[in-house]
Protein backbone atom coordinates (compact mmCIF):
# COMPACT_ATOMS: atom_id res chain seq x y z
CA UNK A 1 0.00 0.00 0.00
CA UNK A 2 1.15 3.19 -0.40
CA UNK A 3 1.86 5.30 2.66
CA UNK A 4 2.04 8.78 0.66
CA UNK A 5 -0.47 11.64 2.89
CA UNK A 6 -3.76 12.16 1.47
CA UNK A 7 -3.70 13.49 -1.97
CA UNK A 8 -7.37 15.03 -1.51
CA UNK A 9 -7.56 19.17 -2.07
CA UNK A 10 -9.36 20.76 -0.06
CA UNK A 11 -13.43 21.39 -1.00
CA UNK A 12 -13.49 23.67 -3.54
CA UNK A 13 -10.52 23.06 -5.14
CA UNK A 14 -11.01 20.88 -8.82
CA UNK A 15 -10.02 17.82 -7.18
CA UNK A 16 -9.57 15.90 -10.91
CA UNK A 17 -7.12 18.78 -12.15
CA UNK A 18 -5.24 18.80 -9.15
CA UNK A 19 -4.86 15.41 -8.65
CA UNK A 20 -3.47 14.38 -12.28
CA UNK A 21 -2.05 17.91 -13.42
CA UNK A 22 -0.83 17.14 -17.33
CA UNK A 23 2.65 17.49 -18.12
CA UNK A 24 4.31 16.88 -21.74
CA UNK A 25 7.84 18.17 -20.84
CA UNK A 26 9.72 14.71 -20.24
CA UNK A 27 12.03 14.47 -16.74
CA UNK A 28 15.49 13.41 -17.30
CA UNK A 29 16.77 10.37 -15.39
CA UNK A 30 18.34 11.49 -12.06
CA UNK A 31 21.15 9.73 -13.12
CA UNK A 32 23.25 10.13 -16.27
CA UNK A 33 24.03 7.16 -18.34
CA UNK A 34 27.91 6.09 -17.27
CA UNK A 35 30.07 4.26 -19.40
CA UNK A 36 29.69 0.43 -19.00
CA UNK A 37 32.23 -0.61 -16.22
CA UNK A 38 32.03 -3.88 -16.86
CA UNK A 39 33.63 -4.45 -20.05
CA UNK A 40 34.18 -8.51 -19.58
CA UNK A 41 30.47 -8.50 -19.29
CA UNK A 42 30.07 -8.18 -23.25
CA UNK A 43 29.32 -11.16 -24.22
CA UNK A 44 25.79 -13.25 -25.16
CA UNK A 45 25.14 -16.20 -22.73
CA UNK A 46 23.07 -19.02 -23.69
CA UNK A 47 21.15 -19.23 -20.69
CA UNK A 48 19.71 -16.92 -18.33
CA UNK A 49 17.69 -13.43 -18.30
CA UNK A 50 16.92 -12.27 -21.88
CA UNK A 51 18.98 -9.38 -21.35
CA UNK A 52 21.92 -11.50 -20.94
CA UNK A 53 21.01 -14.03 -23.65
CA UNK A 54 20.89 -10.40 -26.00
CA UNK A 55 23.54 -10.48 -29.07
CA UNK A 56 23.18 -6.53 -27.80
CA UNK A 57 23.34 -7.19 -23.38
CA UNK A 58 22.94 -5.11 -21.07
CA UNK A 59 22.47 -3.94 -17.07
CA UNK A 60 19.83 -2.21 -15.29
CA UNK A 61 20.34 0.08 -13.07
CA UNK A 62 17.84 1.67 -10.44
CA UNK A 63 16.45 4.90 -9.94
CA UNK A 64 14.73 5.25 -7.08
CA UNK A 65 12.69 8.61 -6.01
CA UNK A 66 10.48 8.15 -3.19
CA UNK A 67 8.25 11.38 -4.17
CA UNK A 68 8.15 9.52 -7.21
CA UNK A 69 5.45 7.46 -8.38
CA UNK A 70 6.50 3.87 -9.31
CA UNK A 71 9.52 4.79 -7.13
CA UNK A 72 12.23 2.37 -8.53
CA UNK A 73 12.47 2.79 -12.40
CA UNK A 74 15.00 0.95 -14.42
CA UNK A 75 17.03 2.09 -16.86
CA UNK A 76 19.23 -0.20 -19.39
CA UNK A 77 22.65 0.40 -19.74
CA UNK A 78 24.51 -1.25 -22.80
CA UNK A 79 27.78 -4.01 -22.24
CA UNK A 80 28.66 -3.67 -25.67
CA UNK A 81 29.00 -0.81 -28.42
CA UNK A 82 28.28 -2.77 -31.47
CA UNK A 83 26.69 -6.35 -31.11
CA UNK A 84 27.80 -9.47 -30.12
CA UNK A 85 28.38 -12.53 -33.10
CA UNK A 86 25.76 -15.30 -32.92
CA UNK A 87 28.07 -17.15 -33.90
CA UNK A 88 31.17 -17.24 -31.27
CA UNK A 89 28.54 -15.28 -28.79
CA UNK A 90 31.60 -13.39 -27.71
CA UNK A 91 33.66 -11.16 -30.75
CA UNK A 92 31.76 -8.21 -31.43
CA UNK A 93 30.22 -7.85 -34.84
CA UNK A 94 31.18 -4.22 -36.03
CA UNK A 95 27.90 -4.39 -39.11
CA UNK A 96 25.67 -3.85 -35.81
CA UNK A 97 25.27 -1.42 -33.02
CA UNK A 98 23.90 -1.69 -29.80
CA UNK A 99 21.34 0.90 -29.26
CA UNK A 100 19.35 2.11 -26.55
CA UNK A 101 15.44 2.15 -26.93
CA UNK A 102 13.68 4.64 -25.15
CA UNK A 103 10.54 5.54 -23.88
CA UNK A 104 8.56 8.34 -22.00
CA UNK A 105 7.09 6.66 -19.30
CA UNK A 106 4.22 7.95 -17.40
CA UNK A 107 5.18 8.59 -13.58
CA UNK A 108 3.37 11.08 -10.67
CA UNK A 109 5.37 13.54 -8.71
CA UNK A 110 3.77 14.47 -5.23
CA UNK A 111 3.58 17.82 -4.50
CA UNK A 112 1.89 19.88 -1.46
CA UNK A 113 -1.28 20.70 -2.19
CA UNK A 114 -2.80 24.33 -0.92
CA UNK A 115 -5.98 24.35 0.50
CA UNK A 116 -7.83 27.88 0.48
CA UNK A 117 -6.66 30.09 1.88
CA UNK A 118 -2.91 28.75 0.67
CA UNK A 119 -2.31 26.54 3.75
CA UNK A 120 -1.03 23.27 3.39
CA UNK A 121 -3.36 20.12 2.85
CA UNK A 122 -1.46 17.26 2.53
CA UNK A 123 0.10 15.69 -0.97
CA UNK A 124 -1.20 15.93 -4.96
CA UNK A 125 0.06 13.96 -7.68
CA UNK A 126 1.48 15.49 -10.74
CA UNK A 127 1.71 13.97 -13.69
CA UNK A 128 4.70 13.97 -16.28
CA UNK A 129 6.58 12.08 -18.61
CA UNK A 130 9.83 10.30 -17.94
CA UNK A 131 12.37 8.95 -19.93
CA UNK A 132 13.72 5.57 -19.87
CA UNK A 133 15.73 3.35 -21.24
CA UNK A 134 14.26 -0.27 -21.67
CA UNK A 135 16.60 -2.25 -23.45
CA UNK A 136 19.37 -2.23 -25.86
CA UNK A 137 18.33 -3.44 -29.25
CA UNK A 138 20.75 -4.72 -31.93
CA UNK A 139 20.45 -2.43 -35.20
CA UNK A 140 22.07 -2.01 -38.55
CA UNK A 141 24.09 1.12 -38.52
CA UNK A 142 21.90 4.34 -40.55
CA UNK A 143 23.05 4.80 -43.97
CA UNK A 144 23.31 8.78 -44.62
CA UNK A 145 22.38 9.89 -47.47
CA UNK B 1 -7.52 17.64 -17.80
CA UNK B 2 -8.77 14.88 -16.05
CA UNK B 3 -12.71 15.31 -16.03
CA UNK B 4 -12.77 12.37 -14.08
CA UNK B 5 -14.81 12.86 -10.62
CA UNK B 6 -13.36 13.79 -7.31
CA UNK B 7 -11.33 10.36 -6.53
CA UNK B 8 -11.36 11.34 -2.66
CA UNK B 9 -13.14 9.08 -0.38
CA UNK B 10 -15.59 10.44 2.15
CA UNK B 11 -14.32 11.71 5.66
CA UNK B 12 -12.38 9.27 7.70
CA UNK B 13 -11.00 6.61 5.11
CA UNK B 14 -7.74 6.09 4.51
CA UNK B 15 -6.93 8.35 1.66
CA UNK B 16 -3.87 6.83 0.66
CA UNK B 17 -5.06 3.12 0.96
CA UNK B 18 -8.23 4.07 -0.88
CA UNK B 19 -7.05 6.05 -3.45
CA UNK B 20 -3.82 3.80 -4.64
CA UNK B 21 -4.83 0.15 -3.81
CA UNK B 22 -1.88 -2.14 -4.69
CA UNK B 23 -2.51 -5.63 -6.45
CA UNK B 24 0.58 -7.33 -7.47
CA UNK B 25 -1.70 -9.28 -9.84
CA UNK B 26 -0.03 -8.41 -12.84
CA UNK B 27 -3.31 -7.74 -15.82
CA UNK B 28 -2.96 -9.46 -19.02
CA UNK B 29 -3.04 -7.75 -22.05
CA UNK B 30 -6.50 -7.29 -23.55
CA UNK B 31 -5.36 -9.21 -26.63
CA UNK B 32 -3.58 -11.98 -27.04
CA UNK B 33 0.26 -11.64 -29.51
CA UNK B 34 -0.70 -12.41 -32.87
CA UNK B 35 1.18 -14.26 -35.35
CA UNK B 36 2.39 -11.50 -37.68
CA UNK B 37 -0.18 -10.38 -40.48
CA UNK B 38 2.38 -8.61 -42.99
CA UNK B 39 5.54 -10.81 -43.47
CA UNK B 40 7.01 -8.69 -45.67
CA UNK B 41 7.86 -6.38 -42.85
CA UNK B 42 10.69 -9.01 -41.70
CA UNK B 43 14.05 -7.08 -42.79
CA UNK B 44 16.27 -4.73 -40.75
CA UNK B 45 16.21 -0.93 -42.41
CA UNK B 46 18.73 0.94 -42.63
CA UNK B 47 17.09 3.99 -41.28
CA UNK B 48 13.61 4.73 -39.78
CA UNK B 49 13.22 4.48 -36.33
CA UNK B 50 14.84 1.53 -33.78
CA UNK B 51 12.07 -0.50 -34.48
CA UNK B 52 12.42 -1.06 -38.10
CA UNK B 53 16.56 -1.21 -38.11
CA UNK B 54 16.52 -3.85 -35.52
CA UNK B 55 17.71 -7.28 -36.84
CA UNK B 56 14.66 -8.40 -34.20
CA UNK B 57 12.22 -6.06 -36.18
CA UNK B 58 8.83 -5.17 -34.34
CA UNK B 59 5.72 -2.87 -34.77
CA UNK B 60 3.45 -1.31 -31.92
CA UNK B 61 0.32 -2.03 -31.69
CA UNK B 62 -2.27 -0.02 -29.63
CA UNK B 63 -4.12 -1.31 -26.39
CA UNK B 64 -6.37 1.85 -25.22
CA UNK B 65 -8.48 1.22 -22.42
CA UNK B 66 -10.79 4.28 -21.12
CA UNK B 67 -10.73 3.18 -17.64
CA UNK B 68 -7.23 2.92 -17.15
CA UNK B 69 -4.23 5.55 -16.78
CA UNK B 70 -2.47 5.61 -19.40
CA UNK B 71 -5.11 4.92 -21.43
CA UNK B 72 -3.09 4.44 -24.33
CA UNK B 73 -0.29 0.83 -24.25
CA UNK B 74 1.58 -0.30 -26.74
CA UNK B 75 2.27 -3.31 -27.07
CA UNK B 76 5.33 -4.74 -29.47
CA UNK B 77 5.11 -7.87 -31.72
CA UNK B 78 7.55 -9.06 -33.75
CA UNK B 79 7.61 -9.19 -37.22
CA UNK B 80 10.17 -12.11 -37.70
CA UNK B 81 10.49 -15.76 -35.75
CA UNK B 82 14.51 -15.22 -35.56
CA UNK B 83 17.03 -12.48 -36.49
CA UNK B 84 17.43 -10.75 -39.64
CA UNK B 85 21.13 -11.17 -40.63
CA UNK B 86 23.54 -8.23 -40.55
CA UNK B 87 24.83 -8.85 -43.66
CA UNK B 88 22.12 -8.65 -45.81
CA UNK B 89 19.14 -7.40 -43.34
CA UNK B 90 16.48 -9.40 -45.26
CA UNK B 91 17.74 -13.03 -44.69
CA UNK B 92 16.90 -14.70 -41.34
CA UNK B 93 19.92 -16.23 -39.53
CA UNK B 94 18.51 -19.58 -38.04
CA UNK B 95 21.42 -18.98 -34.68
CA UNK B 96 18.94 -16.25 -33.16
CA UNK B 97 15.65 -16.12 -32.21
CA UNK B 98 13.76 -12.54 -32.18
CA UNK B 99 12.13 -12.90 -28.57
CA UNK B 100 9.82 -10.62 -26.87
CA UNK B 101 10.91 -8.55 -23.70
CA UNK B 102 8.22 -8.24 -21.11
CA UNK B 103 7.83 -5.81 -18.68
CA UNK B 104 5.34 -5.47 -15.50
CA UNK B 105 4.07 -1.86 -16.12
CA UNK B 106 2.60 -0.11 -13.31
CA UNK B 107 -0.92 1.48 -14.35
CA UNK B 108 -4.31 2.72 -12.32
CA UNK B 109 -7.75 1.59 -13.09
CA UNK B 110 -10.37 3.96 -12.55
CA UNK B 111 -13.11 2.18 -9.81
CA UNK B 112 -16.14 3.34 -7.68
CA UNK B 113 -15.04 4.98 -4.46
CA UNK B 114 -17.65 4.33 -1.67
CA UNK B 115 -18.85 6.38 1.13
CA UNK B 116 -19.17 5.74 4.64
CA UNK B 117 -22.47 4.00 4.00
CA UNK B 118 -21.86 2.39 0.93
CA UNK B 119 -22.67 5.12 -1.57
CA UNK B 120 -20.54 6.13 -4.50
CA UNK B 121 -18.91 8.96 -4.14
CA UNK B 122 -16.59 9.47 -7.37
CA UNK B 123 -13.98 7.42 -8.76
CA UNK B 124 -10.63 6.03 -6.66
CA UNK B 125 -7.61 4.51 -8.44
CA UNK B 126 -6.46 1.19 -8.40
CA UNK B 127 -2.82 0.25 -8.58
CA UNK B 128 -2.32 -2.46 -10.79
CA UNK B 129 0.67 -4.52 -12.77
CA UNK B 130 0.05 -5.15 -16.47
CA UNK B 131 1.85 -7.16 -18.74
CA UNK B 132 3.22 -4.88 -21.37
CA UNK B 133 5.95 -5.97 -24.62
CA UNK B 134 8.43 -3.55 -24.67
CA UNK B 135 10.78 -4.58 -27.70
CA UNK B 136 11.70 -7.80 -29.73
CA UNK B 137 15.53 -8.64 -28.76
CA UNK B 138 17.56 -10.72 -30.63
CA UNK B 139 19.00 -13.56 -28.42
CA UNK B 140 21.26 -17.03 -28.51
CA UNK B 141 18.84 -19.38 -28.23
CA UNK B 142 19.12 -21.29 -24.92
CA UNK B 143 21.24 -24.23 -24.44
CA UNK B 144 19.25 -27.12 -22.67
CA UNK B 145 21.27 -28.86 -20.00
CA UNK C 1 -4.30 26.35 -39.51
CA UNK C 2 -4.83 22.39 -39.81
CA UNK C 3 -5.15 21.16 -42.98
CA UNK C 4 -5.26 17.34 -44.20
CA UNK C 5 -4.80 16.83 -47.88
CA UNK C 6 -5.30 13.43 -49.71
CA UNK C 7 -3.97 12.08 -52.89
CA UNK C 8 -6.45 11.90 -55.67
CA UNK C 9 -8.63 9.94 -57.33
CA UNK C 10 -8.40 6.23 -58.20
CA UNK C 11 -9.60 3.13 -60.35
CA UNK C 12 -8.37 -0.31 -59.48
CA UNK C 13 -9.31 -3.73 -61.20
CA UNK C 14 -10.18 -6.20 -58.63
CA UNK C 15 -7.67 -8.30 -56.61
CA UNK C 16 -4.91 -5.09 -57.40
CA UNK C 17 -4.02 -2.90 -54.08
CA UNK C 18 -4.24 0.66 -53.26
CA UNK C 19 -2.00 2.86 -51.24
CA UNK C 20 -3.89 6.20 -50.21
CA UNK C 21 -1.56 9.24 -48.80
CA UNK C 22 -2.67 11.85 -46.34
CA UNK C 23 -0.43 15.18 -45.96
CA UNK C 24 -0.62 16.78 -42.55
CA UNK C 25 0.29 20.54 -42.15
CA UNK C 26 -0.47 23.23 -39.36
CA UNK C 27 0.17 21.31 -36.12
CA UNK C 28 2.40 18.66 -35.07
CA UNK C 29 2.44 15.57 -36.80
CA UNK C 30 3.42 13.43 -34.19
CA UNK C 31 1.28 14.50 -31.59
CA UNK C 32 -1.93 13.22 -32.68
CA UNK C 33 -2.93 10.00 -34.19
CA UNK C 34 -4.06 9.78 -37.76
CA UNK C 35 -7.41 7.78 -37.95
CA UNK C 36 -8.48 6.55 -41.65
CA UNK C 37 -12.43 5.78 -42.27
CA UNK C 38 -14.30 5.05 -45.26
CA UNK C 39 -17.94 5.36 -46.94
CA UNK C 40 -19.19 3.42 -49.20
CA UNK C 41 -21.98 5.24 -51.70
CA UNK C 42 -24.97 5.56 -49.60
CA UNK C 43 -23.51 3.85 -46.54
CA UNK C 44 -22.95 4.46 -42.96
CA UNK C 45 -19.19 5.51 -41.80
CA UNK C 46 -16.48 2.40 -41.29
CA UNK C 47 -13.65 2.86 -39.03
CA UNK C 48 -10.46 1.29 -40.45
CA UNK C 49 -8.01 1.68 -37.95
CA UNK C 50 -5.04 4.15 -36.55
CA UNK C 51 -1.78 5.33 -36.66
CA UNK C 52 0.50 6.62 -33.89
CA UNK C 53 3.03 8.63 -35.96
CA UNK C 54 5.34 8.92 -32.85
CA UNK C 55 6.09 5.50 -32.74
CA UNK C 56 4.38 3.76 -35.66
CA UNK C 57 1.51 2.12 -33.33
CA UNK C 58 -1.34 0.65 -34.79
CA UNK C 59 -4.78 -0.58 -34.39
CA UNK C 60 -6.47 -1.81 -37.28
CA UNK C 61 -10.16 -3.10 -37.59
CA UNK C 62 -10.18 -7.03 -37.82
CA UNK C 63 -13.59 -6.61 -40.39
CA UNK C 64 -10.71 -6.08 -43.16
CA UNK C 65 -9.22 -9.19 -42.38
CA UNK C 66 -5.57 -8.02 -42.27
CA UNK C 67 -6.30 -6.25 -45.79
CA UNK C 68 -5.12 -2.95 -44.29
CA UNK C 69 -1.68 -1.46 -43.54
CA UNK C 70 -1.35 1.75 -42.22
CA UNK C 71 2.55 3.67 -42.31
CA UNK C 72 3.84 7.14 -41.71
CA UNK C 73 6.26 9.28 -42.57
CA UNK C 74 7.53 11.31 -40.26
CA UNK C 75 9.87 13.36 -42.42
CA UNK C 76 7.32 14.56 -44.47
CA UNK C 77 4.06 14.60 -42.10
CA UNK C 78 2.48 11.90 -44.56
CA UNK C 79 0.33 9.00 -43.21
CA UNK C 80 -0.60 6.55 -45.61
CA UNK C 81 -3.42 3.57 -45.97
CA UNK C 82 -3.06 0.80 -47.99
CA UNK C 83 -5.72 -1.51 -48.42
CA UNK C 84 -4.81 -5.14 -50.97
CA UNK C 85 -6.77 -7.68 -52.20
CA UNK C 86 -9.58 -5.09 -53.85
CA UNK C 87 -13.32 -5.89 -54.40
CA UNK C 88 -15.92 -3.89 -55.78
CA UNK C 89 -16.98 -3.12 -52.63
CA UNK C 90 -14.52 -1.97 -51.38
CA UNK C 91 -15.63 1.39 -53.93
CA UNK C 92 -15.74 4.52 -51.84
CA UNK C 93 -14.55 7.25 -50.10
CA UNK C 94 -11.44 7.26 -47.84
CA UNK C 95 -10.77 9.66 -45.03
CA UNK C 96 -8.01 10.42 -43.10
CA UNK C 97 -9.04 12.45 -39.84
CA UNK C 98 -7.16 13.59 -37.29
CA UNK C 99 -7.65 12.06 -33.58
CA UNK C 100 -7.98 15.00 -30.96
CA UNK C 101 -7.95 13.77 -26.97
CA UNK C 102 -7.67 15.18 -23.62
CA UNK C 103 -6.63 13.07 -20.57
CA UNK C 104 -9.44 11.26 -19.91
CA UNK C 105 -12.60 12.11 -21.65
CA UNK C 106 -12.70 12.22 -25.54
CA UNK C 107 -11.16 10.94 -28.70
CA UNK C 108 -12.52 12.48 -31.39
CA UNK C 109 -11.95 13.28 -35.15
CA UNK C 110 -11.68 16.78 -34.91
CA UNK C 111 -10.00 17.38 -38.54
CA UNK C 112 -10.70 15.42 -42.12
CA UNK C 113 -9.19 14.94 -45.15
CA UNK C 114 -11.08 16.06 -48.57
CA UNK C 115 -11.96 12.40 -49.30
CA UNK C 116 -10.36 10.09 -51.63
CA UNK C 117 -12.61 7.71 -53.97
CA UNK C 118 -11.46 4.82 -54.79
CA UNK C 119 -13.33 2.84 -57.66
CA UNK C 120 -12.80 -0.86 -58.01
CA UNK C 121 -14.30 -2.32 -61.29
CA UNK D 1 -18.07 -5.32 -32.12
CA UNK D 2 -20.52 -2.29 -30.43
CA UNK D 3 -23.68 -1.34 -32.60
CA UNK D 4 -24.60 1.65 -32.87
CA UNK D 5 -28.18 2.35 -34.03
CA UNK D 6 -29.66 5.36 -34.86
CA UNK D 7 -33.29 6.51 -34.85
CA UNK D 8 -35.30 8.14 -37.56
CA UNK D 9 -33.06 7.22 -40.45
CA UNK D 10 -34.44 10.20 -41.90
CA UNK D 11 -36.96 13.08 -40.75
CA UNK D 12 -38.34 16.25 -42.44
CA UNK D 13 -38.86 19.42 -40.39
CA UNK D 14 -39.62 22.50 -40.57
CA UNK D 15 -37.10 26.15 -40.06
CA UNK D 16 -37.57 26.82 -36.21
CA UNK D 17 -39.09 22.97 -34.77
CA UNK D 18 -36.80 21.23 -32.51
CA UNK D 19 -35.60 18.36 -33.66
CA UNK D 20 -34.28 15.19 -31.64
CA UNK D 21 -32.50 12.29 -33.11
CA UNK D 22 -31.60 9.20 -31.05
CA UNK D 23 -29.05 6.63 -30.70
CA UNK D 24 -28.43 3.44 -29.28
CA UNK D 25 -25.61 1.43 -28.46
CA UNK D 26 -25.93 -2.40 -27.90
CA UNK D 27 -23.64 -2.21 -24.69
CA UNK D 28 -23.03 0.32 -21.95
CA UNK D 29 -20.64 2.92 -23.32
CA UNK D 30 -20.66 5.58 -20.57
CA UNK D 31 -20.25 8.68 -22.21
CA UNK D 32 -18.14 7.96 -24.68
CA UNK D 33 -19.78 8.95 -28.11
CA UNK D 34 -19.14 11.54 -30.38
CA UNK D 35 -21.96 13.20 -33.39
CA UNK D 36 -20.83 14.05 -36.61
CA UNK D 37 -22.68 16.34 -39.12
CA UNK D 38 -21.94 15.48 -43.16
CA UNK D 39 -23.74 18.21 -45.38
CA UNK D 40 -24.40 16.45 -48.78
CA UNK D 41 -21.14 16.44 -50.68
CA UNK D 42 -18.85 17.33 -47.56
CA UNK D 43 -16.35 15.59 -45.45
CA UNK D 44 -17.63 15.11 -41.84
CA UNK D 45 -17.34 17.37 -38.98
CA UNK D 46 -17.14 16.98 -35.62
CA UNK D 47 -20.34 18.36 -33.34
CA UNK D 48 -20.52 17.06 -30.03
CA UNK D 49 -17.65 15.16 -28.38
CA UNK D 50 -17.88 13.20 -25.14
CA UNK D 51 -21.80 13.13 -25.36
CA UNK D 52 -22.81 16.87 -24.82
CA UNK D 53 -19.85 18.82 -25.88
CA UNK D 54 -20.12 20.83 -28.11
CA UNK D 55 -16.59 21.43 -30.53
CA UNK D 56 -15.08 25.06 -30.98
CA UNK D 57 -17.18 26.87 -33.62
CA UNK D 58 -20.42 24.59 -33.28
CA UNK D 59 -23.64 27.00 -32.79
CA UNK D 60 -24.99 25.90 -29.15
CA UNK D 61 -28.31 25.30 -30.67
CA UNK D 62 -26.81 21.71 -30.63
CA UNK D 63 -26.52 19.58 -27.57
CA UNK D 64 -26.40 16.25 -26.61
CA UNK D 65 -27.29 13.67 -23.36
CA UNK D 66 -27.64 10.35 -22.56
CA UNK D 67 -24.91 7.76 -20.59
CA UNK D 68 -25.10 4.19 -20.78
CA UNK D 69 -26.69 2.89 -23.96
CA UNK D 70 -28.79 6.12 -24.84
CA UNK D 71 -27.74 9.05 -26.49
CA UNK D 72 -30.04 11.67 -27.81
CA UNK D 73 -28.57 14.71 -30.25
CA UNK D 74 -31.02 18.15 -30.12
CA UNK D 75 -31.61 20.90 -32.17
CA UNK D 76 -33.10 23.79 -30.23
CA UNK D 77 -33.96 25.57 -33.54
CA UNK D 78 -33.63 24.08 -36.70
CA UNK D 79 -32.14 26.92 -39.57
CA UNK D 80 -31.79 25.82 -43.45
CA UNK D 81 -27.84 25.18 -42.88
CA UNK D 82 -28.54 22.10 -40.31
CA UNK D 83 -29.73 20.14 -43.56
CA UNK D 84 -27.24 17.30 -43.18
CA UNK D 85 -26.73 13.44 -42.54
CA UNK D 86 -25.53 13.06 -38.47
CA UNK D 87 -23.97 10.32 -37.05
CA UNK D 88 -22.75 8.87 -34.01
CA UNK D 89 -19.94 7.20 -33.01
CA UNK D 90 -19.10 5.20 -30.01
CA UNK D 91 -15.22 5.30 -28.58
CA UNK D 92 -15.06 2.92 -25.75
CA UNK D 93 -13.46 0.50 -27.67
CA UNK D 94 -11.83 -0.52 -31.10
CA UNK D 95 -13.25 -0.85 -33.30
CA UNK D 96 -14.66 2.32 -33.18
CA UNK D 97 -18.57 2.36 -34.44
CA UNK D 98 -20.72 4.64 -36.46
CA UNK D 99 -24.64 4.50 -36.41
CA UNK D 100 -25.81 4.24 -40.01
CA UNK D 101 -26.59 8.24 -40.07
CA UNK D 102 -29.96 10.17 -39.84
CA UNK D 103 -30.46 12.16 -42.78
CA UNK D 104 -32.12 15.61 -41.77
CA UNK D 105 -34.62 17.54 -43.90
CA UNK D 106 -36.36 20.74 -44.20
CA UNK D 107 -39.83 20.72 -45.20
Known amino acids: YSHWPSCCPSKGQDTSEELLRWSTVPVPPLEPARPNRHPESCRASEDGPLNSRAISPWRYELDRDLNRLPQDLYHARCLCPHCVSLQTGSHMDPRGNSELLYHNQTVFYRRPCHGEKGTHKGYCLERRLYRVSLACVCVRPRVMG | YSHWPSCCPSKGQDTSEELLRWSTVPVPPLEPARPNRHPESCRASEDGPLNSRAISPWRYELDRDLNRLPQDLYHARCLCPHCVSLQTGSHMDPRGNSELLYHNQTVFYRRPCHGEKGTHKGYCLERRLYRVSLACVCVRPRVMG | EVQLVESGAEVKKPGASVKVSCKAS????????MNWVRQAPGQRLEWMGL????????SYNQNFKGRVTLTVDTSASTAYLELNSLRSEDTGVYYC???????????????WGQGTLVTVS | DIQMTQSPSSLSASVGDRVTITCSAS??????LNWYQQKPGKVPKLLIY???SLHSGVPSRFSGSGSGTDFTLTISSLQPEDVATYYC?????????FGQGTKLEIK
Open chain 4, 27 to 32: QGISNY
Open chain 3, 51 to 58: INPYNGGT
Open chain 3, 97 to 111: AREDYDSWTFFAMDY
Open chain 4, 89 to 97: QQYLAFPYT
Open chain 4, 50 to 52: YTS
Open chain 3, 26 to 33: GYSFSGYT
